[in-house]
């Protein structure tokens, strides 16, 4: 079993609406048909799972209905979008890819994407 390389951008700035997108690309060592993608967040010496999806190659990623993540896949690339972000959600977002089927199982973990989120300034009150 060999390590699987996973690449992702070093830094992403979330939009003013709290949306951040990045590509997670993995070097598949075999012809996987079932892939699991997990987004982890590391901040303040704690790692938490943000979202996860299992998909069949050639099909769309399906996250849970209440997930803050959406995504699409194309070959060995996964385009991930995280929404509803606020300044307190700034942190390192790590892409974890597992090739579930067929065996053998492969695992790859990216170096992480630092996502910066800046809360928009509230509109000043106006007399007009």
């Amino acid at each position: 079993c060999k390590a699987m390389h996973v690449a992702q951008p070093a830094v992403v700035l979330a939009s003013s609406r709290g949306i951040a997108s990045f590509v997670c690309e993995y070097a598949s060592p075999g012809k996987a048909t079932e892939v699991r993608v997990t987004v982890l967040r590391q901040a303040d010496s704690q790692v938490t799972e943000v979202c996860a999806a299992t998909y069949m190659m050639g099909n769309e990623l399906t996250f849970l209905d209440d997930s803050i993540c959406t995504g699409t896949s194309s070959g060995n690339q996964v385009n991930l979008t995280i929404q509803g972000l606020r300044a307190m959600d700034t942190g390192l977002y790590i892409c974890k890819v597992e090739l579930m089927y067929p065996p053998p199982y492969y695992l790859g973990i990216g170096n992480g994407t630092q996502i910066y989120v800046i809360d928009p300034e509230p509109c000043p009150d106006s007399d007009f």
Epitope: A3, L107, G108
Partner: nanobody, 130 residues
Framework: EVQLVESGGGLVQPGGSLRLSCAAS????????LGWFRQAPGKGREAVST???????SYADSVKGRFTISRDNAKNTLYLQMNSLRPEDTAVYYC????????????????????????WGQGTLVTVSS
């Protein structure tokens, strides 16, 4: 297929010592992280110590100075020498492999660090009691 098999657990009195071993096979990572985790009854899994492919080691604050991690590359075996054992060290101890050494050194003092590891042994029980 990756296989990790731990051994060396048992019952020991407070202040005693144990040496855990983990025999690894089936992986060919050139750069990786090997770690020891533990899970006490009713608690989550926590990283105890890690060692990367360069031999750099890291320890949880609770075991620093008492536990020593090492590896024998020729035998593909990971070790954890545990001295001055305390009742709070009672747990099932697991060895694990992580594919990205970037997260190795910080794992022992990071909650949820098990997310960075993907291959696990079956565990060996360590009980510290008089």
């Amino acid at each position: 297929e990756v296989q990790l098999v731990e051994s060396g657990g048992g019952l020991v009195q407070p202040g005693g010592s144990l040496r855990l071993s983990c025999a690894a096979s089936g992986y060919t990572y050139s750069r990786h992280c090997l770690g020891w985790f533990r899970q006490a009854p009713g608690k989550g899994r926590e990283a105890v110590s890690t060692i990367d492919s360069d031999g750099s080691t890291s320890y949880a604050d609770s075991v620093k100075g008492r536990f020593t991690i090492s590896r024998d590359n020729a035998k593909n075996t990971l070790y954890l020498q545990m001295n001055s054992l305390r009742p709070e060290d009672t747990a099932v101890y697991y060895c694990a492999i992580g594919p990205n050494p970037r997260y190795c050194s910080g794992a022992p003092n990071t909650r949820g660090a098990e997310h960075y590891f993907g291959y696990w042994g079956q565990g060996t029980l360590v009980t510290v009691s008089s």
